[in-house]
């Protein structure tokens, strides 16, 4: 018996097209949409257990959906790798494994899914409601990272209910061609929309195959995960003992806000600009909170679970301190 | 074997820069962050800054601010450190150093001396 | 910045003895329940190694003679039983504070 946190993957709904063939014109525009929505966007899920037999042992699994080969990937806790988390293990498909305390057992299960083995006691050992964290390097769509943890107030034996998470990160997104075929298809989505502004709409027929709702469902309140594809990181903040953010970031803010890099090989990219969605300024960060975003200046509550978004981490030691690489 | 390869010795004249070179070996490269740590002889260790590989981020000591300039080439797995304007406090012995967050820097170059001497 | 300052600055000792090294921190080097103290040994003509990670993970391929303790601002190397091949100088380092990882002064081990 195992309690279990999973962390699907999102995939955004499919409505079926009345009339689809009768509506030609109207084709161009759900497919351009569907790509807007869904191209350059692979996905990582997250599965976090903790054993009914050792209370304290975790077994974090971790997938990608892209179609690109994995180059690396990092596990971390505490926090997503540079931005609050430390270091459990690294994989890598050719040159090997490396893992750190108290990770014990860390393997490939697949092409595209590892598996990593915590053990259950000792001064450095995970609580229940750590924050776990897999990040997949690919060519071609770059760095993506998720995080997940247990409910604080699971019991073992039991399954926790699947709950949403963003698509984390991009660091590397994709390849700029692709980017600019997309971009286009996207503006001309827009120019079509307008021209149709006056039209009767088609009517949408709920999906007829059971999968599909939920689907819909995962996809429609997540705001958060199209936000976080826009701002350069997002994590579920619950960690066991979630440091303030003065002292996450004890220089009063990001330091590595102002050096973002500026090319769009390194710049988040996500399905749909959200031209509202403000970017967070230098030592400024953007809540989501039950599906609302609060900007800088309020500090979000770090007694429960939540989503933060923080700026693309510097690197080891936005891991390393409060973080953990350096 | 995970291995950092430095460049060799530089005796330079004071005023002048110096760029070292370390050549990251290991597919950590991508993953961690490149440090940089000064010695002087019969010193101890001083953290100069480092260089973040996947996020192109570099963080400095306040006290090295002006004086190191921190770089990488991905595609050759090189970070790189300048100091400029040399005077004869900055010869050193100068490490280069990766690590994974959190678990201090697991892998040291073998060091390069550099001599500021007129 | 946080300083870190070890005890004593030299140490003599005779084979098989336990060694004790003292690090205290001027602040707590604390986060996310964990101890962002490491601890290195180097050697004349040598970079320094990697011995304990996180207050008290001990890194690959290092003797479990070899141990480290501690949380928040106080941290102990120990070396039991001391052997010819330790006569070195052991630095702590604290990575929990950005973008400064300050090292301690060091502790020179010493055989008599």
């Known amino acids: 018996m195992r309690t279990e946190a999973q962390v699907p993957a999102l995939q955004p709904p499919e409505p079926g097209l009345e009339g689809a063939m009768g509506h030609r014109t109207l084709v161009l525009p759900w497919v351009l949409l569907t790509l807007c929505v869904t191209a350059g966007t692979p996905e990582v899920w997250v599965q976090v257990r903790m054993e009914a037999t050792e209370l304290s042992s975790f077994t974090i699994r971790c997938g990608f959906l892209g179609s690109g080969s994995i180059s690396l990937v990092t596990v971390s806790w505490g926090g997503p790798n540079g931005a609050g988390g430390t270091t459990l293990a690294v994989l890598h498909p050719e040159r090997g494994i490396r893992q750190w305390a108290p990770a014990r057992q860390a393997r490939w299960e697949t092409q595209s899914s590892i598996s990593l083995i915590l053990e259950g006691s000792g001064a450095s050992s995970p609580c229940a409601n750590t924050t776990f964290c897999c990040k997949f390097a690919s060519f071609p769509e770059g760095s993506w990272e998720a995080c997940g943890s247990l409910p604080p107030s699971s019991d073992p034996g039991l399954s926790a209910p699947p709950t949403p998470a963003p698509i984390l990160r991009a660091d590397l997104a994709g390849i700029l061609g692709v980017s600019g075929v997309l971009l286009f298809g996207c503006v001309y989505l827009l120019h079509l929309l307008r021209r149709h502004k006056h039209r009767p709409a088609p009517r949408l027929q709920p999906s007829r195959t059971s999968p599909q709702a939920p689907r819909a469902r995962a996809w429609a309140p997540s705001q958060a995960s199209q936000a976080a594809l826009h701002v350069p990181y997002a994590t579920i903040n619950t960690s066991c003992r979630p440091a303030t953010l003065d002292t996450a970031h004890p220089h009063g803010g990001p330091s590595w806000w102002a050096s973002l890099p500026t090319h769009a090989a390194h710049r988040p990219q996500g399905p749909a600009a959200w031209a509202s969605t403000p970017i967070p300024a230098r030592g400024s960060f953007v809540s989501v909170e039950n599906g609302l975003y609060a900007q800088a200046g309020e500090r979000p509550p770090h007694t429960g679970p939540g989503l933060t978004l923080f700026p693309d981490p510097r690197g080891p030691r936005a891991m390393e301190g409060p973080l953990g690489v350096r | 074997q995970h291995e950092l390869q430095q460049s060799g010795a530089e005796l330079v004249r004071p005023g002048s820069s110096v760029k070292l070179s370390c050549k990251d070996s290991y597919f950590a490269f991508m993953a961690s962050a490149m440090h940089w740590v000064k010695q002087r002889p019969g010193h101890g260790l001083e953290w100069i800054g480092s260089f973040t590989m996947y996020s192109d981020a570099t963080e400095y000591s306040e006290n090295f601010k002006g004086k190191a300039t921190l770089t990488a080439n991905t595609s050759s797995n090189t970070a790189y450190m300048e100091l400029s304007s040399l005077i004869s406090e900055d010869s050193a012995v100068y490490y280069c150093?990766?690590?994974?967050?959190?678990?201090?820097?697991?892998?040291w170059g073998q060091g390069t001396l550099v001599t500021v001497s007129a | 910045d946080i300083v870190l300052t070890q005890s004593p600055a030299s140490l003599a000792m005779s084979l098989g003895q336990r060694a004790t090294i003292s690090c205290r921190a001027s602040e707590s080097v604390d986060n996310y329940g964990i101890s962002f103290m490491h601890w290195y040994q180097q050697k004349p003509g040598q970079p320094p190694k990697l011995l304990i990670y996180r207050a008290s993970n001990l890194e690959s391929g290092i003797p479990a003679r070899f141990s480290g303790s501690g949380s928040r601002t106080d941290f102990t190397l120990t070396i039991n039983p001391v052997e010819t091949d330790d006569v070195a100088t052991y630095y702590c380092?604290?990575?929990?504070?950005?973008?400064?990882?300050?090292f301690g002064g060091g502790t020179k081990l010493e055989i008599r």
């Open positions: 380092q604290q990575s929990n504070k950005d973008p400064m990882y300050t």
């Open positions: 150093a990766s690590g994974y967050s959190g678990n201090g820097f697991t892998y």
